[in-house]
C-alpha cells in the first residue's frame, strides 16, 4: 500500500529535510574540525564506549520504548532514529557555537558527541507525548527548537549559577518532560470516533517496548555518569544509579500488581517505572554517600511512577490528549522534580554539616535554577506547539493519528495491520 502522505508533504518533507541537511553539512565544512592532538588510544576507546552506551539508549532504548502502539510501532522506532540523527548534528554545532566559537572553529571531540547525544535524548523523551499525532516535517521543527532551547538553557545555567556539565545536563529530565507536555497541549486533542483502537497497545509492540525499557535499564548508569569529571564521582554515580534502578524494577512490578484489583501486572506501568530510580537519582547520583539511600530513592521513585501511571493518564488524556501508554512525560516530570528535591536536600545537609549559615541562599539558587529550566521548557514547548499547528506542515488529520500506514509503504497489506 503506498504512502498516504498528502502530495504537498511529499514535496515538503524531502525538500525541508535535505535542505536542512545540506545546511548542516556546510556549517560543518566551514566551522568545525577534529581534535588532532595525540592521545592515549586506550583512553580513546574507553571514552567512545560511554558514547556508544548513550547511542544505544537513544536509538534502541527510547526508540523501542515508544513503540507500544498497535498501529504506530514502525513510525515510533524510525522517527526516533531520524530525530536522534538530526538532533546530534545540530547539538554538536550549537554546543560548539555557544562554548567555543570565540576561537573561530568548533573542535569536535568524542566528548562533544557525548554531549550532543544527551541533548538529542531530550527530544526523544519529549516526543513520547506527541508521537502519532505529528509527521516527520513537524518533528524536524521540534528537534531544532528543543535542542536549541536546551543548549541555551545549559549555557545560561552554567553562566548564571556556575554549574558544571553534569548539573546543567541533569535538568534534561524536567526540561524534556515539560517541553513535551506543553507541545502536546497545543496539538489537536480529540480522537475521532473509530480511531480509539489505534492508540491501544498490542502484544508484539509491547514486547518491543519492554525491550526498549531493558536497554534503558542496562545503560542508565552510563547516562547518569557520562559527564562527571573524575573516576570516583563516576564510580559513585554508576553504583547509585544501578542500586536505584534495581530497586525501582522490584517496586514497579510489585507495585503494579498491588495497584490492580486482581493483582495483575500492567505492561504500561512496568515499561516506565523500571526507569524511575535512574531518573530520580540523576542529579545527585554522584553525591549520594551510601547504597541504602539510593535504594530508598529507587523505592520511592518506583512507587511514584506506578501511582502516577495509575492516576494521571486520565487527566493527561483529557487535558493534553496524551494516550494512556505515553506516560514518559508526566513520569519524568514527577521523577525529575523528585531528583531535584533530593539534590536540594543534599545541598542543605552539606551546608549544615560544614557549619555555615548560607542554607537559604543555596536553596534559593537551586530553586531558581530548577524554575528557570521549567519556564524555558514550557515557553519553548508552547512556541514549538504553535509552530507545529501551522498549516504549512500538513499535519496528519486526527483520523490518521497513530497510524503507520500514513507514513510507511506496506506492499503486503491491503487494509489495516
Amino acid at each position: 500500500m503506498s504512502s498516504k502522505y498528502p502530495r504537498s508533504v511529499r514535496r515538503c518533507l524531502p525538500l525541508w529535510a535535505l535542505t536542512l541537511e545540506a545546511a548542516l553539512i556546510l556549517l560543518f565544512y566551514f566551522f568545525t574540525h577534529y581534535d588532532a592532538s595525540l592521545e592515549d588510544q586506550k583512553g580513546l576507546v574507553a571514552s567512545y564506549q560511554v558514547g556508544q552506551d548513550l547511542t544505544v539508549m537513544a536509538a534502541i532504548g527510547l526508540g523501542f520504548l515508544t513503540s507500544s502502539f498497535r498501529r504506530h510501532s514502525w513510525s515510533s522506532v524510525a522517527f526516533n532514529l531520524f530525530m536522534l540523527a538530526l538532533g546530534v548534528q545540530w547539538a554538536i554545532l550549537l554546543d560548539g557555537f555557544l562554548s567555543q566559537f570565540p576561537s573561530g572553529k568548533v573542535v569536535i571531540t568524542l566528548f562533544s558527541i557525548r554531549l550532543a547525544t544527551m541533548s538529542a535524548l531530550s527530544v526523544l523523551i519529549s516526543v513520547d507525548a506527541v508521537l502519532g499525532k505529528v509527521n516527520l516535517a513537524q518533528l524536524v521543527v521540534m528537534v531544532l527548537v528543543e535542542v536549541t532551547a536546551l543548549g541555551n538553557l545549559r549555557m545560561v545555567i552554567s553562566n548564571i549559577f556556575n554549574t558544571d556539565y553534569h548539573m546543567n545536563m541533569m535538568h534534561i529530565y524536567v526540561f524534556a518532560a515539560y517541553f513535551g507536555l506543553s507541545v502536546a497541549w497545543c496539538l489537536p486533542k480529540p480522537l475521532p470516533e473509530g480511531t480509539e483502537d489505534k492508540d491501544q497497545t498490542a502484544t508484539i509492540p509491547s514486547l518491543s517496548a519492554m525491550l526498549g525499557a531493558l536497554f534503558l535499564w542496562m545503560f542508565w548508569p552510563s547516562f547518569n555518569s557520562a559527564l562527571l569529571r573524575s573516576p570516583i564521582e563516576r564510580k559513585n554515580a554508576v553504583f547509585n544509579t544501578y542500586y536505584a534502578v534495581a530497586v525501582s524494577v522490584v517496586t514497579a512490578i510489585s507495585g503494579s500488581s498491588l495497584a490492580h484489583p486482581q493483582g495483575k501486572i500492567s505492561k504500561t506501568y512496568v515499561h516506565s517505572a523500571v526507569l524511575a530510580g535512574g531518573v530520580a537519582v540523576g542529579t545527585s547520583c554522584h553525591l549520594i554517600p551510601s547504597p541504602w539511600l539510593a535504594m530508598v530513592l529507587g523505592l520511592v521513585a518506583g512507587l511514584i511512577s506506578v501511582g502516577g501511571a495509575k492516576y494521571l493518564p486520565g487527566c493527561c488524556n483529557r487535558v493534553l490528549g496524551i494516550p494512556h501508554s505515553s506516560i514518559m512525560g508526566y513520569n519524568f516530570s514527577l521523577l525529575g522534580l523528585l531528583g531535584e528535591i533530593i539534590y536540594i536536600v543534599l545541598l542543605v545537609l552539606d551546608t549544615v554539616g560544614a557549619g555555615n549559615g548560607m542554607i537559604g541562599f543555596q536553596v534559593l539558587l537551586s530553586i531558581g535554577e530548577l524554575s528557570l529550566a521549567i519556564v524555558i521548557a514550557l515557553m519553548s514547548g508552547l512556541l514549538t506547539g504553535l509552530l507545529l499547528n501551522l498549516k504549512i506542515w500538513k499535519a496528519p488529520h486526527e483520523a490518521k493519528y497513530f497510524d503507520d500506514q500514513v507514513f510507511w509503504k506496506f506492499p503486503h497489506l491491503a487494509v489495516g495491520f
Partner: antibody, heavy 125, light 106 residues
C-alpha cells in the same frame, strides 16, 4: 612520592609554536584530571587548560582558545601543551598541576594538590 | 566566577593575626582553595573546600566562608609565612584565581 616535571620551555618568536611536556610519577596518572596554569613575570596565577582523567574532555581559558591544545598520554604518564600562534602576552612560567577530588560532607571539592616546578616560556622577537 | 582579593598587599609583624578576604562574582558554594607562593617557587595548597586544612599545613592557617565571601586567617604570623597568597575557585571552569595578596614584613 608524587612528582610533576615540566620541560619544553624556551625562547620563541611571536607566531611560532612550542610544545610543553609534564612527566608525572608517584601516582596513578590515568585517574587524575590535569591542568596547566601560568604566571607572567611579576603577575598573578592564570589558569590555562584542563584535560579530564580519560582525555575525553578538554577546556581552555578564553585567552588561549583555538591556539593551545592540551593532551595526555596515559601510557607514558605524560601531559602536553601544544602552543601555536604564540604572542608576547603568553610569556610566563607554565606549571602543570594535578586535580584531586575529595568529598566534603556531601559535595565533592577539587584542588590542585601537587604542582610542577614550572618551565619558562619567553615569546620575543 | 571572578575572584577579588583584598587587600592586594599588607604589612604585618611576626605574631600578628592576619586576615585576607576573597569575594566571588557568583555563588561558588564552598569550592574555594587558598595557595601560598614564595618567589621562584610553585604555589602550595593551604586550604581546600573553603575551610579544610591540607595535610602538612600548620594549624595556624584557617579558612571560612561559603557562597560568595571567603576568608583566610593566619592566627599568629611566622617568619616563613611572608609570601603571596592566592584564592582560587574550582566550582566550574574556567578555574579562576584571585589577583593575590602579598604579605610583607612590617
Amino acid at each position: 612520592e608524587v612528582q610533576l616535571l615540566e620541560s619544553g620551555g624556551g625562547v620563541v618568536q611571536p607566531g611560532r609554536s612550542l610544545r610543553l611536556s609534564c612527566a608525572a610519577s608517584g601516582f596513578t596518572f590515568s585517574t587524575y584530571g590535569m591542568h596547566w596554569v601560568r604566571q607572567a613575570p611579576g603577575k598573578g596565577l592564570e589558569w590555562v587548560a584542563v584535560i579530564w582523567f580519560d582525555g575525553s574532555n578538554k577546556e581552555y581559558a578564553d585567552s588561549v582558545k583555538g591556539r593551545f591544545t592540551i593532551s595526555r598520554d596515559n601510557s607514558k604518564n605524560t601531559l602536553y601543551l601544544q602552543m601555536n600562534s604564540l604572542r608576547a602576552e603568553d610569556t610566563a612560567v607554565y606549571y602543570c598541576a594535578r586535580e584531586e577530588v575529595v568529598r566534603g560532607v556531601i559535595l565533592w571539592s577539587r584542588k590542585f594538590d601537587y604542582w610542577g616546578q614550572g618551565t619558562l616560556v619567553t615569546v620575543s622577537s | 566566577a571572578e575572584l577579588t582579593q583584598s587587600p592586594s598587599s599588607l604589612s604585618a609583624s611576626v605574631g600578628d593575626r592576619v586576615t585576607i578576604t576573597c569575594r566571588a562574582s557568583q555563588n561558588i558554594r564552598r569550592s574555594l582553595n587558598w595557595y601560598q607562593q614564595k618567589p621562584g617557587k610553585a604555589p602550595k595548597l593551604l586550604i581546600y573546600a573553603a575551610s579544610s586544612l591540607q595535610s602538612g599545613v600548620p594549624s595556624r592557617f584557617s579558612g571560612s566562608g561559603s557562597g560568595t565571601d571567603f576568608t583566610l586567617t593566619i592566627s599568629s604570623l611566622q617568619p616563613e609565612d611572608f609570601a603571596t597568597y592566592y584564592c582560587q575557585q574550582s566550582s566550574n571552569t574556567p578555574w579562576t584565581f584571585g589577583q593575590g595578596t602579598k604579605v610583607e614584613i612590617k
